[in-house]
Interface confidence: low
């Protein structure tokens, strides 16, 4: 969490941002909140990005003002116009690109004063893994698949029964480039699995960590997946 204050003494307002990550090809949110004002027409929101000549987005007098918007963001940004009056300056970024990563500033002007806060935005690809029993294999084998990751993640297997065991010798992981030539499909195979055990396939890069669990018993198979972004810090 980053909290910024205006620089002009008593004419300052608190602006708060939260570092976040964008999943390339999908829509993302750059979070920013501020002390609300009673009049929408008195609120100016500017989103800026370090190293970019034009603005990322500007909202003033109750509507978007995009005459100074940089071409790399054209047609891809929007604020939640109905929530600005209650202090939400968050930016929706459509079709997140790898190049959208960087440091952003949420700059706010209201009748109470000015304030700003920076936000670190990471971009990459991350997806939920699914673990299945590979019935085609000659021995008891589990197959963990996740369709989109970038940068290349690490894959680690763990087991509830054999806690702390190193499965690198009995697993094989491959990365297959997807058609857009950026993200990759992750496939990891674990051999010699035992019944009545819970196995976890953990995929992690510097943006996200995802886990796929599978519990195999004589009578049933239970699956569970979980994904966590690693850099959600507020400012």
């Amino acid at each position: 969490l980053i909290i910024g204050f205006g620089i002009s003494g008593r004419h300052s307002i608190t602006v708060t941002t939260v570092a976040s990550a964008g999943n390339i090809g999908e829509d993302g949110i750059l979070s920013c909140t501020f002390e609300p004002d009673i009049k929408l027409s008195d609120i100016v929101i500017q989103w800026l990005k370090e190293g970019v000549l034009g603005l990322v987005h500007e909202f003033k007098e109750g509507k978007d003002e995009l005459s100074e918007q940089d071409e790399m963001f054209r047609g891809r940004t929007a604020v939640f116009a109905d929530q600005v009056i209650v202090g939400n300056a968050s930016l929706r970024l459509k079709n997140v690109q790898l190049t959208d990563a960087g440091t952003y500033k949420c700059y706010i002007i209201t009748s109470k004063g000015k304030g700003n806060a920076n936000l670190e935005y990471k971009t990459g690809a991350f997806s939920m893994p699914e673990v299945n029993v590979d019935y085609n294999a000659s021995s008891e084998t589990l197959r963990c698949e996740a369709p989109r990751w970038f940068p290349q993640p690490t894959v680690v297997w763990a087991s509830q029964v054999d806690q702390g065991a190193n499965f690198s010798e009995v697993s094989n992981t491959s990365f297959e480039l997807n058609s857009e030539n950026v993200t990759m499909k992750v496939v990891s195979v674990l051999y010699n699995v035992t019944i009545n055990n819970t196995y976890s396939c953990m995929i992690e890069n510097d943006i996200a960590k995802a886990t796929g669990d599978i519990k195999v018993t004589e009578s049933e198979i239970k699956r569970r997946s979980h994904l966590q972004l690693l850099n959600s810090k507020a400012s």
Epitope: Q46, L48, K49, E50, G51, V52, L53, G54, L55, E68, D70, E71, M72, T99, K105, Y107, N116
Partner: antibody, heavy 121, light 107 residues
Framework: EVQLLESGGGLVQPGGSLRLSCAAS????????MSWVRQAPGKGLEWVSA????????YYADSVKGRFTISRDNSKNTLFLHMNSLRAEDTAVYYC??????????????WGQGTLVTVSS | DIQMTQSPSTLSASVGDRVTITCRAS??????LAWYQQKPGKAPKLLIY???SLESGVPSRFSGNGSGTEFTLTISSLQPDDLATYYC?????????FGQGTKVEIK
């Protein structure tokens, strides 16, 4: 140490063309916007053109729009200014400058030594 | 377009004097103003940005002030090395505009 070294200036006839280059070193060139600024003999500074770090966005002063083109080659750490349809009033020392983009707080923190362009018949 | 007007055009002062240069914008520019120093035959050098922030390595005798339409550059104690022309500059996302310059001479 940041260094900017302009070249390509010289004498050219009205209506002619010239290409200025600026070789950059001492910093990650592709991370910075760059600008050209000129100064006519005995006169003040005039901003000419700017380009984003990636080269995707370019901006021009009204006085050169349609005649000058700014570009960059990030693999060679070089900035260019292609000048066409040159006029006598384009005579100036042309400086390349690193254009610090810190969220709209854009300033020129490093400058080259300049290259003189003279447009005369 | 926003116009920047500096005054005076030329200023003559003695070593140790307090010197003030004014820059006026034709409309409000918030704090988007920088000051540069250009010594004879040299490239300009950044002194102040965002109206009052001192660039690193610049002597503390230089200071900037103002917001909106009126800005000042002050040299608290003029030194022989300060002989130069000083320019103010407005900047926004896509344009840069310089004032016409103020030449500072040493008496």
């Amino acid at each position: 140490e940041v260094q900017l070294l302009e070249s390509g200036g010289g004498l050219v006839q009205p209506g002619g063309s010239l290409r200025l280059s600026c070789a950059a070193s001492g910093f990650t060139f592709s991370s910075y916007a760059m600008s050209w600024v000129r100064q006519a003999p005995g006169k003040g500074l005039e901003w000419v053109s700017a380009i984003s770090g990636s080269g995707g966005s370019t901006y021009y002063a009204d006085s050169v729009k349609g005649r000058f083109t700014i570009s960059r080659d990030n693999s060679k750490n070089t900035l260019f200014l292609h000048m066409n349809s040159l006029r006598a009033e384009d005579t100036a020392v042309y400086y390349c400058a690193r254009d610090i983009q810190w969220f709209g707080e854009s300033v020129f923190d490093y400058w080259g030594q300049g290259t003189l362009v003279t447009v005369s018949s | 377009d926003i116009q920047m007007t500096q005054s005076p055009s030329t200023l003559s002062a003695s070593v140790g004097d307090r010197v003030t240069i004014t820059c006026r914008a034709s409309q409000s520019i918030s704090s988007w103003l920088a000051w540069y120093q250009q010594k004879p035959g040299k490239a300009p050098k950044l002194l102040i940005y965002k109206a009052s922030s001192l660039e690193s390595g610049v002597p503390s005798r230089f200071s900037g002030n103002g917001s909106g339409t009126e800005f000042t550059l002050t040299i608290s104690s003029l030194q022989p090395d300060d002989l130069a022309t000083y320019y103010c500059q407005y900047y926004n996302s896509y344009s840069r505009t310089f004032g016409q310059g103020t030449k500072v001479e040493i008496k």
